[in-house]
């Protein structure tokens, strides 16, 4: 028969014959022969291969370096890489999460729209009219101005995006 020019899925062509690829979690030791199937062996501890492959070396699991603010979110297996995330209060600088930076704080006049996660930074928004924030915070939302009326008080000083209104007593009617 004619030697194959293409092979089925999960096979590869070598020396004019189709050999089975090694399954995820295993590396290639020797190609198949006319007598034997492909020789594959498992990846060692702290190694992985996540596809059907003909790799002669497994990949090293990612190291979550605590000096860069990283910690393990999901331990790697022979078929998956380790997933890193950032320590509390920090977030990844990239999708690959190779290092972390401190969560951004929202300045006075801005409130937190979305609290940061291990992979995304704080999202701030300006406090709209009727709301204020007088602190720099990674958690605080804009607070509504105090309603003087509900306290039977009147506005003595108008609020801003950074300050609350100041309420005071109503002027007494003179007899």
């Amino acid at each position: 028969p004619e030697p194959p020019t293409a092979c089925r899925e999960k096979q590869y062509l070598i020396n004019s014959q189709c050999c089975s690829l090694c399954q995820p979690g295993q590396k290639l030791v020797s190609d198949c022969t006319e007598f034997t199937e492909t020789e594959c062996l498992p990846c060692g501890e702290s190694e992985f291969l996540d596809t059907w492959n003909r790799e002669t070396h497994c990949h090293q699991h990612k190291y979550c370096d605590p000096n860069l603010g990283l910690r393990v979110q999901q331990k790697g297996t022979s078929e998956t890489d380790t997933i890193c995330t950032c320590e509390e209060g920090w977030h990844c600088t990239s999708e690959a999460c190779e290092s972390c930076v401190l969560h951004r704080s929202c300045s006075p006049g801005f409130g937190v729209k979305q609290i940061a996660t291990g992979v995304s930074d704080t999202i701030c928004e300006p406090c709209p009219v009727g709301f204020f924030s007088n602190v720099s915070s990674a958690f605080e939302k804009c607070h509504p101005w105090t309603s003087c009326e509900t306290k039977d008080l009147v506005v003595q000083q108008a609020g801003t995006n950074k300050t609350d209104v100041v309420c005071g007593p109503q002027d007494r009617l003179r007899a």
């Epitope: 070598i14 020396n15 290639l28 030791v29 020797s30 190609d31 022969t33 007598f35 034997t36 020789e39 062996l41 498992p42 060692g44 501890e45 003909r54 002669t56 070396h57």
Partner: antibody, heavy 117, light 110 residues
Framework: EVQLEESGGDLVQPGASLRLSCAVS????????MSWVRQAPGKGLEWVSS?????????YYASWAKGRFTISKDASKTTLYLQMNSLRAEDTATYFC?????????WGQGTLVTVSS | DIVMTQSPSSLSASVGDRVTITCQAS??????LAWYQQKPGQAPKLLIY???TLASGVPSRFSGSGSGTDFTLTISSLQPEDFATYYC????????????FGQGTKVVIK
């Protein structure tokens, strides 16, 4: 055609060194692990060493071979080597090269090493 | 190192006999066990690998079984060309790779 051909066997004195070669043809040398196995006259098979595939293939040895024997390969020459130092009378054997590690489907015909004074 | 203990070291049998050879590993080798046949003046020939997988071209009268430490080679009906020496090879695979052969079983005509 797949071929493994050993060479370098000789009659040497105890303490001498010898380098065996195994010329490989008919298959991709870079993606195949290789092993050396020896057989003393009238005796059984004895695993000596293995080298894994890839450019920086890991090497492994039987405990008695560690320190005296070194397995290596030259991908450009598609040749496997076994460097043997401080040879002893008990190293007298036919040395076979074979393809694989946990299974050895392809063997050379062997080269005879005789260590005698 | 790993030690592979093969038994018997020799056996006499007749054509048509069922022959069983055993191999015991000194530690678990999973299924990394192979069986070889060797005739005088020849290189060994692979019969079975991964404990029970028959190498292509090997007659179906040969079979292998076992895992861990205990393994068996069976020849269901001995043929004249089967008189030879048989070896098991076990491999410990992990952080290191160590292989070893059994001492061999010589099958002779009764």
């Amino acid at each position: 055609e797949v071929q493994l051909e050993e060479s370098g066997g000789d009659l040497v004195q105890p303490g001498a060194s010898l380098r065996l070669s195994c010329a490989v043809s008919g298959f991709d040398f870079s993606s195949n692990a290789m092993s050396w196995v020896r057989q003393a006259p009238g005796k059984g098979l004895e695993w000596v060493s293995s080298i894994y595939a890839g450019s920086s293939g890991s090497t492994y040895y039987a405990s008695w071979a560690k320190g005296r024997f070194t397995i290596s390969k030259d991908a450009s020459k598609t040749t496997l080597y076994l460097q043997m130092n401080s040879l002893r009378a008990e190293d007298t054997a036919t040395y076979f090269c074979a393809r694989g590690v946990t299974r050895l489907p392809l063997w050379g015909q062997g080269t005879l090493v005789t260590v005698s004074s | 190192d790993i030690v592979m203990t093969q038994s018997p070291s020799s056996l006499s049998a007749s054509v048509g006999d069922r022959v069983t050879i055993t191999c015991q590993a000194s530690q678990s080798i999973s299924s990394y066990l192979a069986w070889y046949q060797q005739k005088p003046g020849q290189a060994p020939k692979l019969l079975i690998y991964d404990a029970s997988t028959l190498a292509s071209g090997v007659p179906s009268r040969f079979s292998g079984s076992g895992s861990g430490t205990d393994f068996t080679l069976t020849i269901s009906s001995l043929q004249p060309e089967d008189f030879a020496t048989y070896y098991c090879q076990g491999t410990v695979y992990g952080s290191s790779t160590i292989s070893a052969f059994g001492q061999g079983t010589k099958v002779v005509i009764k």
